[in-house]
Amino acid sequence: KKVVLGKKGDTVELTCTASQKKSIQFHWKNSNQIKILGNQGSFLTKGPSKLNDRADSRRSLWDQGNFPLIIKNLKIEDSDTYICEVEDQKEEVQLLVFGLTANSDTHLLQGQSLTLTLESPPGSSPSVQCRSPRGKNIQGGKTLSVSQLELQDSGTWTCTVLQNQKKVEFKIDIVVLAFQKASSIVYKKEGEQVEFSFPLAFTVEKLTGSGELWWQAERASSSKSWITFDLKNKEVSVKRVTQDPKLQMGKKLPLHLTLPQALPQYAGSGNLTLALEAKTGKLHQEVNLVVMRATQLQKNLTCEVWGPTSPKLMLSLKLENKEAKVSKREKAVWVLNPEAGMWQCLLSDSGQVLLESNIKVLPTWSTPVQP
């Protein structure tokens, strides 16, 4: 018996071939011997089966001795043994229809779980293997679960159902709702304007929700809400903003915040959350601000950084075009009795400069100038 696998909602064509290459009488029946369709001369006739409005054949092939049964918009319950009667012969074809669906919406928040459920006919014992867009393979039976979805899981999932050494492939498009970056860090000199950007990693027609930026300053004992906002059809409107600092927010996507001045008291970490309409859970992006200050007080030239720097970073003080006078894994370094000239304070990672601030040290009888 020939086995054919079909996909729920698809169309399947079951073949039936006569030895004579001409139009002769044929009938397609199901396992209960109920006629599905057949022919009378050159006319297609249909029986009383449940497939009535979904069954068809190709009259153009009859003259070549081919009498296919076409079933449209397949249902799981169409799984059956179909019998083609032609030239006193019976050809049996077993059709097995499978369906694969995502548990809920195919738009899921980062960190949520995706469950794929296989619908299969009674008596079948299929195995399923799914390949994620990032190439991860997941195997299972009737259900497949992927916990903690990541941004890279966005895209087309390809799932292969295997039964009787035959396979059928399903493609499911999954959209993981997330920010493009889970975390970002901004390095600024004291006094510079700071731009924070929170681009989304997905596009949807209408985007509605509300958001808030909580900030934990390094110098503060507790975090505070810096700004709350609403999002209506991709338009941003500020609901509430602190007086210090007075953040400004762009009116369009991507979400964009401006801090007028980088100051040591603002250095720290923030968490922007975005709650989307009709979605449980929130999107998160961490943002970090590191602020640098170079100062000269009497005979002491000091370079300091505030904020979440990593213990890998080097802080250096050097006279322009000379070797570093001091270079340490610290958040503050200093030079006593610095010689006159342009000094550079550098925050670097394996030689790559992340942040630089210059300070001019004048001969001892005059005061320093900050460019």
């Epitope: 970090n288 979440p308 720097t309 990593s310 213990p311 080097m314 570093a324 894994r329 610290e330 394996s350």
Partner: antibody
Framework: QVQLVQSGAEVKKPGASVKVSCKAS????????INWVRQAPGQGLEWMGI????????SYAQKFQGRVTMTRDTSTSTVYMELSSLRSEDTAVYYC??????????????????????WGQGTTVTVSS | DIVMTQSPDSLAVSLGERATINCKSS????????????LAWYQQKPGQPPKLLIY???TRDSGVPDRFSGSGSGTDFTLTISSLQAEDVAVYYC?????????FGQGTKLEIK
């Protein structure tokens, strides 16, 4: 398996240059720094410099400044150390070593530094007239 | 540059006995900002590259036997091998990575008595 494979032994004349390669395999090449350390016969270890394969940024010991150049080729996961104006005291075994650093910002959970945890087999450079 | 000085230069210890190697830095390698001692210990056997034993002055690298331990803070550090095994015969180096340039101690040769 994580490893660094270095180029073969070299014999050079004083004044010449030598270029030693260090190919990484089984290592996420751009995420970790590569140090160069040398060891003269019967002597201790001497740090020459560091390169970040991701951006190509470098930091050299002052002793080698102007004579050493560290470069990388991300397409082949290889870093190079070129030492010019060779003299007899440059005769040594030259090692590349992966300096592994893991962990986020200091505000986040633990910052883990793993030192120079993977070393190349060493390349012997002999400088002789 | 930070100068690292090890003592003794060589050491002979009986199998199963404790071996202690000291390392002194010319300035503190304890970062007050990150509260970490930027000090590592390496083991080098003849004809082989060095092998990382300890980082952050006291954290054992993965796969390093627990007979090796590191201690100390600021400028004074110690590597201890609680019960010497034959395979521990090697030269041991301390190294600071607090400041560029990184610097190594001159090495301590450990032998079996």
């Amino acid at each position: 398996q994580v490893q660094l494979v270095q180029s073969g032994a070299e014999v050079k004349k004083p004044g010449a240059s030598v270029k030693v390669s260090c190919k990484a395999s089984g290592i996420p090449f751009t995420s970790d720094d590569i140090n160069w350390v040398r060891q003269a016969p019967g002597q201790g270890l001497e740090w020459m410099g560091i390169i970040n394969p991701s951006g190509g940024s470098t930091s050299y010991a002052q002793k080698f400044q102007g004579r050493v150049t560290m470069t990388r080729d991300t397409s082949t996961s290889t870093v190079y150390m070129e030492l010019s104006s060779l003299r007899s005291e440059d005769t040594a075994v030259y090692y590349c070593a992966r300096e592994r650093y893991e962990g986020g910002y200091s505000s986040g959970p633990g910052n883990y530094y793993y030192g120079m945890d993977v070393w190349g087999q060493g390349t012997t450079v002999t400088v002789s007239s | 540059d930070i100068v690292m000085t090890q003592s003794p230069d060589s050491l002979a210890v009986s199998l199963g006995e404790r071996a202690t190697i000291n390392c002194k830095s010319s300035q503190s390698v304890l970062s007050s900002s990150y509260n970490k001692n930027y000090l590592a210990w390496y083991q080098q056997k003849p004809g082989q590259p060095p092998k990382l034993l300890i980082y952050w002055a006291s954290t054992r690298d993965s796969g390093v036997p627990d007979r090796f331990s590191g201690s100390g803070s600021g400028t004074d550090f110690t590597l201890t091998i609680s019960s010497l095994q034959a395979e521990d015969v090697a030269v041991y180096y301390c190294q600071q990575y607090y400041s560029i340039p990184y610097t190594f101690g001159q090495g301590t040769k450990l032998e079996i008595k």
